[in-house]
């Protein structure tokens, strides 16, 4: 039994490392945003025993603009985005709350970006696709970048290639 993709959270990203039952994953507030105190970025794949259907718990995460970054200018395009490490204490406690808000995700106010793809109109950088990989590590820690850029990458090819050593999870997206 596996979970479907977790829900989207405004101004946050998540890299799902496993869709397996009881997997725990963590949302990361976008650059220029920080976690609101008292909210939790954690989600867990759990089983609804009544329906025998797996689902992700709903995170209470709220990503709010970092007031300290409001008056800063965005970094120019084509710069190197460098990430420093900022510890973020977390736990899936009964209350679902974390001890304190995280430090800002970055010193840049940019939150959403778009990419121009040949043969298409301006489109958001987030789009559905397929395939998944089972991995073994679920422990993670939040890092923060010192710069970000005005453009980003987006996977647009439709072909799928999987070399030896990749472990399919068995989950398939429904779009």
């Amino acid at each position: 039994i596996t979970c479907p993709p977790p829900m989207s959270v405004e101004h946050a990203d998540i890299w799902v490392k496993s869709y397996s039952l009881y997997s725990r994953e963590r949302y990361i507030c976008n650059s220029g945003f920080k976690r609101k105190a008292g909210t939790s970025s954690l989600t867990e794949c759990v089983l609804n025993k009544a329906t025998n259907v797996a689902h992700w718990t709903t995170p209470s995460l709220k990503c709010i603009r970092d007031p300290a970054l409001v008056h800063q200018r965005p970094a120019p395009p084509s710069t190197v985005t460098t990430a420093g490490v900022t510890p973020q204490p977390e736990s899936l406690s009964p209350s679902g709350k974390e001890p304190a808000a995280s430090s800002p995700s970055s010193n840049n106010t940019a939150a959403t970006t778009a990419a121009i793809v040949p043969g298409s109109q301006l489109m958001p950088s987030k789009s559905p696709s397929t395939g998944t990989t089972e991995i073994s590590s679920h422990e993670s820690s939040h890092g923060t970048p010192s710069q970000t850029t005005a453009k980003n990458w987006e996977l647009t090819a439709s072909a799928s290639h999987q070399p030896p050593g990749v472990y399919p999870q068995g989950h398939s997206d429904t779009t």
């Epitope: 993709p5 799902v16 395939g131 990989t133 990458w153 996977l155």
Partner: nanobody, 122 residues
Framework: EVQLVESGGGLVQPGGSLRLSCVGS????????VGWYRQTPGKQREWVAV???????DYAGSVKGRFTISRDNAKNTVYLQMNSLKPEDTAVYYC????????????????WGQGTQVTVSS
């Protein structure tokens, strides 16, 4: 076809540093999130770090404070700076062109590079 090429691996002594590079190319190729993974013989591929389009990052607990992920969009390149290397960091390191299932929700795709070997030994 999406192609990923990793480089920068090698033999290093414990406590040393390496910087890995992952260059992406292909028709209309751009990535909203890029992850680094590593694998040792007989073990499952293990997630190491990710960098999202906004520039925010996340790390596995085993590498936090020692590894730094960054990206240069002008060069379609993602880097993994590895400091204070330990023998247990020995592995083949792969980058992955992540895909998006819901807005802001990403995971590993089936696009992998050939990997680059990192060996930490005295």
């Amino acid at each position: 076809e999406v192609q990923l090429v990793e480089s920068g691996g090698g033999l290093v002594q414990p406590g040393g540093s390496l910087r890995l590079s992952c260059v992406g190319s292909g028709d209309g190729f751009s990535i909203s999130a890029v992850g680094w993974y590593r694998q040792t013989p007989g073990k499952q591929r293990e997630w190491v770090a990710v960098i999202f389009a906004s520039g925010s990052t996340d790390y596995a607990g085993s590498v936090k404070g020692r590894f730094t992920i960054s990206r240069d969009n002008a060069k379609n390149t993602v880097y993994l700076q590895m400091n204070s290397l330990k023998p247990e960091d020995t592995a083949v390191y792969y980058c992955n062109a992540g895909v998006t299932t819901n807005p802001g929700v990403h995971r590993a795709s089936s696009y992998w590079g050939q990997g680059t070997q990192v060996t930490v030994s005295s």
